[in-house]
Interface confidence: low
């Protein structure tokens, strides 16, 4: 079938259109184009005879049409009047006619639109603004853009006049945006330049910054005022109702208490004619004095004296604060505060109470700290310690002993041998000692301030023969899989070798066994019941050797899971039930029984004579080791059958 396709269908003025013929028959005489939907000689555009290849213009020919051999018609420089239908009349060689009609539409190329406004300076919450997209164009669609986005849905936005007018009712400051309009038709789309809506608003209630309202005498007062406003607000300051200046900032240097009062910022918008004010109350405080601490006892004695620290000066209606070691006061029954917090009393001072102590006076703005105070607590002397710890020496060596006792002020030391004063020094030195130097060596420490003395006595043995050693232990009853045990071979002697034996054998290699302190100490980690053996230590030097008595390690363990015997679980009615419970444990455990959950007796053996089927049930043995704090249990089911029936059979 003969058809006409318009390319394009929508044509812009000034452009061209091709009426393209499809399914053109063969063996043609010629064809002719007409304006309109039918063949009308008065509206013929052009005719074409194939044989002569001659084109003949018709009455409707405008000079802008070109006909092609394939019957397609090109129309150039399209004008608005070209819109409509075009009919192709084909005359075949047998002079049979065939017709086809096509059409196209012509649209103007749109100009760049512009936006006109009925109000260039609308006032917020009062005015409406109507934007109109210019010029008015037929067959054009109008679109609007706000900040390059399509229009939001809002009851305050209204399109009218075929979308050509955009009205914003009751404008707000948020409507300050870039507005564009766009015109569209099938052949073009043009967007206007943006129009910025300048909404007059405010001033809002001004904000005064900074927010703090309390100042110290001598500081600078610098207040700044800001109110959201378009155009920007004009600012005025009033102090206690009296106008000061028309600036956004108010600066008063070196303020005094007299500058206290109400400070008002007024913001004025000359375009909206509105004023808004905000008031802040400023309080200026006099500078308080720096506090200091006085003490009723500058040299208190430990565990004897109390100390009262007082924060000076005394000021009415003032809050006093205290700090110890830069921390707030700890909760302690030895610390007492007076009702006004001004006095801090330390009851029965200790050497740890030295401080430093600080007090503070709190005013409305800040806290003023005193300088720190340190207490000189007199203490000691504690029991002196004599070093080194050796008690056995060989003849011919030098004996050098040193004494130390914690004390404030530092202790004065004296040495006595067998009760006789030797010298008033911290160290005692005797060269080339002999057996005659054996004896009781006493160190006496004296605190001259407190008048207290403490002594320590050490027995020194000078002998070529080593004494018989002994074993001391840090844990006489260790718990299995929990405790460690450290054996130490005594005494500590110079130039001596220490040896160890377990059950008469030298020490086995084990990660749980560790020698330290010159082999003088043997540590067993994570003891087990197998470690309950005889331990012996030996000492030797170049002259002699000696061995300790054995020490047997008593390892607490268990109770292990108990065993109930006999193992039988089926009994005949009338038999005696005699159950015995046993659990490996050191010390021996306490036993108790429960039948069907009900406590029975606290014995190792449970005996029930002449049992019946009523004695069926669960029999539980509970074991408890009070030394290890551990418990264990086992449950056994007992079945009693009536006489004459075997277990597992029914009559």
């Amino acid at each position: 079938k003969l058809t006409i396709e318009s390319t394009p269908f929508n044509v812009a003025e000034g452009k061209e259109v091709l009426l393209l013929v499809h399914n053109l028959p063969q063996h043609l005489f010629g064809y002719s184009w007409y304006k309109g939907e039918r063949v009308d000689g008065n509206r013929q555009i052009i005719g074409y005879v194939i044989g002569t290849q001659q084109a003949t213009p018709g009455p409707a020919y405008s000079g802008r049409e070109i006909i092609y051999p394939n019957a397609s018609l090109l129309i150039q420089n399209i004008i608005q009047n070209d819109t409509g239908f075009y009919t192709l009349h084909v005359i075949k060689s047998d002079l049979v006619n065939e017709e086809a009609t096509g059409q196209f539409r012509v649209y103007p190329e749109l100009p760049k639109p512009s936006i006109s406004s009925n109000n260039s300076k609308p006032v917020e919450d009062k005015d409406a603004v109507a934007f109109t997209c210019e010029p008015e164009t037929q067959d054009a669609t109008y679109l609007w853009w706000v900040n390059n986005q399509s229009l939001p849905v809002s009851p305050r936005l209204q399109l009218s006049n075929g979308n050509r007018t955009l009205t914003l009712f009751n404008v707000t400051r948020n409507d300050t945006a870039s507005y564009k309009c766009e015109t569209q038709n099938p052949v073009s789309a043009r967007r206007s330049d943006s129009v910025i809506l300048n909404v007059l608003y405010g001033p809002d209630a001004p904000t005064i910054s900074p927010l703090n309202t309390s100042y110290r005498s001598g500081e600078n007062l610098n207040l700044s005022c800001h109110a959201a406003s378009n155009p920007p607000a004009q600012y005025s300051w009033f102090v206690n109702g009296t106008f000061q200046q028309s600036t956004q900032e108010l600066f008063i240097p070196n303020i005094t208490v007299n500058n206290s009062g109400s400070y008002t910022c007024q913001a004025h918008n000359s375009d909206t004619g509105l004023n808004r004010t905000t008031v802040t109350t400023i309080t200026v405080y006099a500078e308080p004095p720096k506090p200091f601490i006085t003490s009723n006892n500058s040299n208190p004695v430990e565990d004897e004296d109390a100390v009262a620290l007082t924060c000076e000066p005394e000021i009415q209606n003032t809050t006093y604060l205290w700090w110890v070691n830069n921390q707030s006061l700890p909760v302690s029954p030895r610390l007492q505060l007076s009702n006004d917090n001004r006095t801090l009393t330390l009851l029965s001072v200790t050497r740890n109470d030295v401080g430093p102590y600080e007090c503070g006076i709190q005013n409305e703005l800040s806290v003023d700290h005193s300088d720190p105070v340190i207490l000189n607590v007199l203490y000691g002397p504690d029991d002196p310690t004599i070093s080194p710890s050796y008690t056995y020496y060989r003849p011919g060596v030098n004996l050098s002993l040193s004494c130390h006792a914690a004390s404030n002020p530092p202790a004065q030391y004296s040495w006595l041998i067998d009760g006789n004063i030797q010298q008033h020094t911290q160290e005692l030195f005797i060269s080339n000692i002999t057996e005659k130097n054996s004896g009781l060596y006493t160190c006496q420490a004296n605190n001259s301030a407190s008048g207290h003395s403490r002594t320590t006595v050490k027995t020194i043995t000078v002998s070529a023969e080593l004494p018989k050693p002994s074993i001391s232990s840090n844990n006489s009853k260790p718990v299995e899989d929990k405790d460690a045990v450290a054996f130490t071979c005594e005494p500590e002697a110079q130039n001596t070798t220490y040896l160890w034996w377990v059950n008469g054998q030298s020490l086995p290699v084990s990660p749980r066994l560790q020698l330290s302190n010159g082999n003088r100490t043997l540590t067993l980690f994570n003891v087990t019941r197998n470690d309950a053996r005889a331990y012996v230590c030996g000492i030797q030097n170049s002259v002699s050797a000696n061995r300790s008595d054995p020490v047997t390690l008593d390892v607490l363990y268990g109770p292990d899971t108990p065993i109930i015997s006999p193992p039988d679980s089926s009994y005949l009615s009338g038999a005696n039930l005699n159950l015995s419970c046993h659990s490996a444990s050191n010390p021996s455990p306490q036993y108790s029984w429960r039948i069907n959950g009900i406590p029975q007796q606290h014995t190792q053996v449970l005996f029930i004579a002449k049992i019946t089927p009523n004695n069926n049930g669960t029999y539980a043995c509970f074991v408890s080791n009070l030394a290890t704090g551990r418990n264990n249990s086992i449950v056994k089911s007992i079945t009693v059958s009536a006489s004459g029936t075997s277990p597992g059979l029914s009559a």
Partner: antibody, heavy 121, light 111 residues
């Protein structure tokens, strides 16, 4: 209705300054621009510059830049044009005219009556 | 700046005749396809009076015999039938861009 009343005629010496006022009524001058145009005797119209009374922003023809100052007082709805360093060729009638969407649809629909400034030694 | 050239400088016609005044801009004064060109009439001793704004719109109170046309750079003021009070000087002005320039004027005088 829109009215523009200009100050009276002035005779000035060369080198001095003149300040012409233009009081507006019937509209808010903050909604418009105020323009100044002058016309020398027997000559055509010459645009001098304009001001936006809402913010005080002004714009001048380069020829007058540095000699002309246009101001506005929104509280009295009055615009001013001050021309300094006067010379004889500044003898002209000076007009004020509002310009903007509200009042004149982007043309000069209303004019002051004009102020004749004569510069003569 | 945009230079406006008016022609003719003087036009001598009789009442009742048709007057055509031309104003040519050195560059387009169109904004969004609308010519921002205006026509003013001035009589001796008077301030200018707006006749036509934006190329073709009659100002308030202007008789219908005054019409304007044109776009881009070429604009025409037409007075269809001259009345005695129409004899005056006519100026065109562009407000497309600063500075807002005027043409040098066309004097319409009685023949």
């Amino acid at each position: 209705q829109v009215q523009l009343v200009q100050s009276g005629a002035e005779v000035k010496k060369p080198g001095s300054s003149v300040k012409v006022s233009c009081k507006a009524s019937g509209f808010n001058i903050k909604d418009t621009y105020m323009h100044w145009v002058r016309q020398a005797p027997g000559q055509g119209l010459e645009w001098m510059g304009r001001i936006d009374p809402a913010n005080g922003n002004s714009k001048y023809v380069p020829k007058f830049q540095g000699r002309v100052t246009i101001t506005a007082d929104t509280s009295t709805s009055t615009a001013y044009m001050e021309l300094s360093s006067l010379r004889s060729e500044d003898t002209a009638v000076y007009y004020c005219a509002p310009f903007g969407y509200y009042v004149s649809d982007y043309a000069m629909a209303y004019w002051g009556q004009g102020t004749l400034v004569t510069v003569s030694s | 700046e945009i230079v406006l050239t008016q022609s003719p400088a003087t036009l001598s016609l009789s009442p009742g005749e048709r007057a055509t005044l031309s104003c040519r801009a050195g560059e387009s004064v169109d904004i969004f396809g609308v010519g921002f060109l205006h026509w003013y009439q001035q009589k001796p001793g008077q301030a200018p009076r707006l006749l036509i704004y934006r190329a073709s719109n009659r100002a308030t109170g202007i008789p219908a015999r005054f019409s304007g046309s044109g776009s881009g750079t070429d604009f025409t003021l037409t007075i269809s039938s001259l009345e005695p009070e129409d004899f005056a000087v006519y100026y065109c002005q562009q407000t497309n861009e600063d500075p807002y320039t005027f043409g040098q004027g066309t004097k319409l005088e009685i023949k």
